[in-house]
């Protein structure tokens, strides 16, 4: 039983206006397009909004009037093939506009983008900022609303509105203070950082529903639902599941409207229904709709009851067990599964779901035993391992981190991971395994009972990010396998690939090593990416390197760096500082 | 593994109904979704309905909806589609369709892991 209304509407581009009021209207529907067709100009975007706006107020003057009784995706799909230029600007998607509904808006999904081919965001100076914002606030937030959304084509849309909020709110704040740089800088900075973040924790899910469906989407719902709300009964958090898991499957297959209208009503009902929750939501419930929603998404975990009882009588020791699993195996499993996750806040949601995997295999095999019992008995020494395995490897990365700071940390796993899938783009190498590094400040930090949570569910979002990428362009058997075999294994996949020795080195080429004086004028980040990129080059042109041959060029590459920034003319010295630098780098490699 | 066998497919007058039925053996679960899916001479196999076999939520092409109507009975383990108002333009191959794991696109045929055989549905004067 879920929360939302089921009741049928005449005019649904009606009900959801007057639910979620003209401004979240037309801001979600501008997000949606946006997703959608990711190269068109914001002006056709609000272009088109605008008609869809005017539209659905006639709807709400009369829910019979003509067209009202339309599907949502009928009457924006409609909307977004009357664009002119789609077949010369999106190709095969075009086609798309011959198919009829609903084959029409999943050829749509299926075209989104996740690394389009558009320019980086260049911040203006805050001045100028400032006077776009006063001029027309309105076009200022739209603006920011679309461009986030055609680069982030699966960002959680309600959740962005909060972010657009948050982005007013600094904005409002800031062009009104003495130093205005000092104030706002910092709070965009935030709200970019946290973003990235926010759409890729929303990719997983997003992927998690495409490719290996609602199950296992419940499944890690579950999981997590449970550590956060361990004093909440199983059919609470069954509910909550069912509930949260049509919210994203709403967002993900582009019904941005329904979704943000049902996150409201979840957000809703647990507040109305917090004593039976968590003790933690008192101050969420307090906030505004966006604050509120976000903030329960976030809300700590509750204290586990004080007197839990052990698992195993009722899953190892119990006479009924295959009985049990035999009667309903889809809630005896999540049982298991939310019983070991309210009792273990300290386990990361992918080896929670590992274990519940293995107790699955485990009773389909002995409950069709001549001694059910007898062959289970010993299910949860399997677990062992499982447990081992994660706790190890954070144990000796955080080690390396601590060791050598985030950066070079970053370069180890560069050098690790384009040796273990060399194939791969090296843009898509250098971001997926900088944000791989980021694991090391984000969670190296915490004490030992939160840090397995912490680091192997983030891995798993950065994992997702490759995953996609590579997607797009499958060039490594090793990725795609690591990728589609099991979501919850991706991680162990990935880590236990060695050096590939089927990869035949790349061809050297001079070009790829050579810099310029603008390399001087780059942020410190810029210039970490800079070296960071020749150092997978480096890789994937000696993938036998040793770890001391590679410091010793990247070592010597930073001097040269670092001397010709100083240099009275810096674009003589890149060039001949270059050739030496690459024919000594050439000796010392054996290129 | 999962069978999937249809029948109840012929020749109808247009205006006419008829009633498919798919009967599913092996390990279908409640995290199943089942489809029917159609596929005219020439043309691209085309989704018509799906079932969540959990909750009972349908899903219709816009060309069908009002007159097709998707159903289960989960004790007989069997999927249905009753076709009323039946039109030249529905002639084509049905196909039963089955998604373990409940994927998000419910139109796309490759994310149908189990078909069955098909039955021919001829609709003409």
């Known amino acids: 039983r879920g929360v939302f209304r089921r009741d049928a509407h005449k005019s649904e581009v009606a009900h959801r206006f007057k639910d979620l009021g003209e401004e979240n209207f037309k801001a979600l529907v501008l997000i949606a397009f946006a997703q959608y067709l990711q190269q068109c100009p914001f002006e056709d975007h609000v272009k088109l909004v605008n008609e869809v706006t005017e539209f659905a107020k006639t709807c709400v003057a009369d829910e019979s009037a003509e067209n009202c009784d339309k599907s949502l995706h009928t009457l924006f799909g409609d909307k977004l093939c009357t664009v002119a230029t789609l077949r010369e600007t999106y190709g095969e998607m075009a086609d798309c506009c011959a198919k009829q509904e609903p084959e029409r808006n999943e050829c749509f999904l299926q075209h989104k983008d996740d690394n389009p081919n558009l320019p980086r965001l260049v911040r203006p100076e805050v001045d100028v900022m400032c006077t776009a914002f006063h001029d027309n606030e309105e076009t200022f937030l739209k603006k920011y609303l679309y461009e986030i959304a055609r680069r982030h084509p699966y960002f959680y849309a309600p959740e962005l509105l909060f972010f657009a909020k948050r982005y007013k709110a600094a904005f409002t704040e800031c062009c009104q203070a003495a130093d205005k740089a000092a104030c706002l800088l910092p709070k965009l900075d935030e709200l970019r950082d946290e973003g990235k973040a926010s759409s890729a924790k929303q990719r997983l899910k997003c992927a998690s529903l495409q490719k290996f469906g609602e199950r296992a989407f419940k499944a890690w719902a579950v999981a997590r639902l449970s550590q956060r709300f361990p004093k909440a009964e199983f059919a609470e958090v069954s509910k909550l599941v069912t509930d949260l898991t049509k919210v994203h499957t709403e967002c993900c297959h582009g019904d941005l409207l329904e979704c943000a209208d049902d996150r409201a009503d979840l957000a809703k009902y647990i507040c109305e229904n917090q004593d039976s929750i968590s003790s933690k939501l008192k101050e969420c419930c307090e906030k505004p709709l966006l604050e509120k929603s976000h903030c329960i998404a976030e809300v700590e975990n509750d204290e586990m009851p004080a007197d839990l009882p052990s698992l195993a009588a009722d899953f190892v020791e119990s006479k009924d067990v295959c009985k049990n699993y035999a009667e309903a195996k889809d809630v005896f499993l999540g049982m298991f599964l939310y019983e070991y996750a309210r009792r273990h806040p300290d386990y990361s949601v992918v080896l929670l779901l590992r274990l519940a995997k293995t107790y699955e295999t485990t009773l389909e095999k002995c409950c069709a035993a001549a001694d059910p019992h007898e062959c289970y008995a010993k299910v949860f020494d399997e677990f062992k391992p499982l447990v081992e395995e994660p706790q190890n490897l954070i144990k000796q990365n955080c080690e390396l981190f601590e060791q050598l700071g985030e950066y070079k940390f970053q370069n180890a796993l560069l050098v690790r991971y384009t040796k273990k899938v060399p194939q791969v783009s090296t843009p898509t190498l250098v971001e997926v395994s900088r944000n791989l590094g980021k694991v090391g400040s984000k969670c190296c930090k915490h004490p030992e009972a939160k840090r397995m949570p912490c680091a192997e569910d983030y891995l798993s979002v950065v994992l997702n990010q490759l995953c996609v990428l590579h997607e797009k362009t499958p060039v490594s058997d090793r990725v795609t396998k690591c990728c589609t075999e099991s979501l919850v294994n991706r991680r162990p996949c990935f880590s236990a690939l060695e050096v590939d020795e089927t990869y035949v080195p790349k061809e050297f080429n001079a070009e790829t090593f050579t810099f310029h004086a603008d390399i001087c004028t780059l942020s410190e980040k810029e210039r970490q990416i800079k070296k960071q990129t020749a150092l997978v080059e480096l890789v994937k042109h000696k993938p036998k390197a040793t770890k001391e041959q590679l410091k010793a060029v990247m070592d010597d590459f930073a001097a040269f760096v670092e001397k010709c920034c100083k240099a009275d003319d810096k674009e003589t010295c890149f060039a001949e500082e270059g050739k030496k630098l690459v024919a000594a780098s050439q000796a010392a490699l054996g290129l | 593994e999962v069978q999937l066998v249809e029948s109840g497919g012929g020749l109808v007058q247009p205006g006419g109904s008829l009633r498919l039925s798919c009967a599913a053996s092996g390990s279908t679960d409640s995290a199943y979704r089942m489809g029917w899916f159609r596929q005219a001479p020439g043309k691209e196999r085309e989704f018509v309905s799906a079932?969540?076999?959990?909750?009972?939520?349908?899903y219709y092409a816009d060309s069908v909806k009002g007159r097709f109507t998707i159903s289960r009975d989960n004790s007989k383990n069997t999927l249905y589609l009753q076709m009323n108002s039946l039109r030249a333009e529905d002639t084509a191959v049905y196909y039963c369709a089955a998604d373990p794991d409940s994927r998000l696109y419910y139109t796309v045929p490759q994310n149908y892991d189990y078909w069955g055989q098909g039955t021919l549905v001829t609709v003409s004067s």
């Open positions: 079932i969540n076999w959990s909750d009972g939520r349908t």
